[in-house]
Interface confidence: medium
């Protein structure tokens, strides 16, 4: 359990031309108030997602009325801190959203009108119990200066406020400068504040304001190496006569804190104080910058010069994701038309077209008759992978441009003679046959077994192919 605290120092026009003179509209005076919203993690949260870690609203600030000739000021702010209590563990990484709202006090129907003036979003890492962190943010033409911190409450301790201690005044041998927690908790309270300047590495205290030295160090602040130690030869945690401590092997031996973190002992455990940019139990975690090469597959990294500022990867063709880590399945967009098969070759896409289609994306229909006229009265027929002309009688070839001999194929059966005619061909049938192609035999009594000849044509007369 604990509380996140936000102190707004100033809100006013940012530097540069075009900065607004007043937060108020022309309708009259206004006053400001602030809303803070906390979301866990460092992910890009949608603006409307809930403030899962909590939210708080400030009081209304003093009424502001624009002075026409006065320079644009920092605006009057609400008094006090904005406090967001948290019941569970402090997550360490969070998104901080600060909204500046304007309350217009003109003669509005239905009371004051509210409007959002500025909104800043920061993704941050912050250990509970640390010092105030200061920040300056711009939102459009406005500039906001603020400080924030997270602190533990209700006897919670640690960088996440997860360790609960109940004070106990009985003396102990918990370790340098640490007192044990209540019997139910195998943890320690925060150490007392030692004398100002007492060496962090070589001194410790069991009571506030004192500074006791580890073996090999001396002086009021334990900063002077001792040439001879009065503790030599002693074993055990302390000597009543000398006040020296001869530490046995402790959890900080070998310094488990990575990246230059400094270690302080807790009973049976340790705690790391991490340098800027590092966090985690052993200071083993840091933010990512462009120097880390976070953009894969040839992506270009932009921004992100320090761990607190974001970087962006510009991905080469064929890759996507925040770090260009995902190969784009370009075929999933189905770029090949008309049932073509898509092949992603890495450097390029290729479409394998079905018969009758062509082009980079199979977009051309080879059967398309548009613009492909058939000459001499022929008609274009689609199908078969290429346009085809059905030619009028007497013409042939791909486009019906060639003259054709209609009798070349010997169309008249049973020895009938073929005559070319302007509209086609005519068969003169041998005796005993009839029909447009002399295909029907004639009975001796002159009656056909198949449909009779049209009126006016006797069996054996030449019949024209209509």
């Amino acid at each position: 359990a604990g509380v996140f605290e936000l102190q707004i120092h100033s809100f006013g026009p940012g530097p540069g031309p075009g900065a607004p003179r007043s937060p108020c509209s022309a309708r009259g005076p206004c006053r400001l108030f602030f809303r803070v919203c906390l979301k866990p993690g460092l992910s890009e949260e949608a603006a409307e997602s809930p403030c899962a870690l909590g939210a708080a609203l400030s009081a209304r600030g003093p009424v502001y009325t624009e002075q026409p000739e006065a320079p644009a000021p920092d605006l009057p702010l609400p008094n006090g801190l904005l406090q967001v209590p948290f019941r569970d563990a402090w997550p360490g990484t969070f998104s901080l959203i600060i909204e500046t709202w304007r309350e217009e006090l003109g003669d509005q129907i239905g009371g004051p009108a509210w409007s959002l003036l500025a909104r800043v979003t920061r993704r941050r890492r912050l250990a509970a119990g640390g010092p105030w962190a200061r920040d300056i943010q711009r939102a459009g033409a406005w500039e906001l200066r603020f400080s924030y911190r997270a602190r533990c409450e209700l006897l919670a301790v640690g960088t996440a406020c997860t360790r609960l201690c109940r004070p106990r005044s009985a003396p102990s041998r918990c370790g340098p400068g640490l007192r044990p927690c209540a019997p139910l908790e195998d943890e320690c309270e925060a150490p007392p504040v030692c004398r100002a300047g007492c060496s962090l590495e070589h001194g410790f205290c069991e009571q506030p304001g004192e500074c006791r030295c580890l073996e090999g160090w001396t002086g009021p602040l334990c900063t002077v190496p001792a040439s001879t130690s009065s503790c030599l030869g002693l074993r055990g945690p302390s000597s009543a006569t000398t006040g020296c401590l001869v530490p046995g092997p402790g959890p900080c031996d070998g310094n488990p804190c990575a990246n230059g973190g400094s270690c302080s002992e807790t009973p049976g455990s340790f705690e790391c104080t991490c340098p800027r940019g590092f966090y985690g139990l052993r200071c083993e975690v840091s933010g990512v910058t462009c120097a880390d090469g976070p953009c894969f597959n040839g992506g270009l990294c932009v921004g992100g010069a320090d761990p607190d500022s974001a970087y962006i990867c510009h991905c080469p063709p064929g890759f996507q994701g925040s770090n260009c880590e995902k190969r784009v399945d370009r075929c999933s967009l189905q770029p090949c038309r008309n049932g073509g098969l898509c092949l992603d070759l890495g450097h390029a896409l290729r479409c394998r077209c079905r018969a009758g289609f062509a082009g980079p994306r199979c977009e051309h229909n080879l059967d398309d008759c548009a613009g492909r006229a058939c000459a001499n009265g022929g008609t274009c027929v689609e199908g078969g992978g290429a346009h085809r002309c059905s030619c009028a009688l007497g013409f042939g070839g791909r486009d019906c441009r060639e003259r054709a001999d209609p009798c070349a194929a010997r169309p008249c059966a049973h020895g009938g003679r073929c005559y070319a005619h302007f509209s086609g061909l005519v068969c003169a049938c041998a005796p005993g046959y009839m029909g447009s192609r002399c295909e029907f035999p004639v009975h001796p009594d002159g009656v056909s077994a198949l449909p009779a000849a049209p009126p006016g044509l006797r069996p054996g007369d030449p019949q024209r192919y209509l």
Epitope: D292, F296, N297
Partner: nanobody, 117 residues
């Protein structure tokens, strides 16, 4: 919880070889990229090599052709084979996991490499 533990450092003559190994636990290889950094006394930390998802590798210009990074996902290890070592390779070498889902780097404790001429 991601934990990285380096081994294989030591002292060696110039021209010799060393193989650094990093035991990685809690690392999801499909969202983390493993790498090696080094920090010489009084200097900043520099990226030596990185093995990206899919097996692409990156090397700093100063180590190209001499160092080789490899990853064994089954054994949860990443290794750095260092050949033709030079005195300027003397540094503390750190194993690293860059995990972009959380947008953080995880670091090992480091292993010292000292190359004498």
């Amino acid at each position: 919880q991601v934990q990285l533990k380096e081994s294989g450092g030591g002292s060696i003559q110039a021209g010799g070889s060393l193989r650094l190994s990093c035991a990685a636990s809690g690392v999801s290889y499909n969202r983390c990229s493993m790498g090696w950094y080094r920090q010489a006394p009084g200097k900043g930390r520099e990226l030596v090599s990185r093995i990206q998802p899919g097996g692409n590798t990156y090397y700093a210009d100063s180590v190209k052709g001499r160092f080789t990074v490899s990853q064994d996902n089954a054994k949860n290890t990443v290794s750095l084979q260092m050949n033709s070592l030079k005195p300027e390779d003397t540094a503390m070498y750190y194993c690293n996991a860059l995990c972009w889902r959380e947008n953080v780097n995880y670091w090992g404790q480091g292993t010292q490499v000292t190359v004498s001429s």
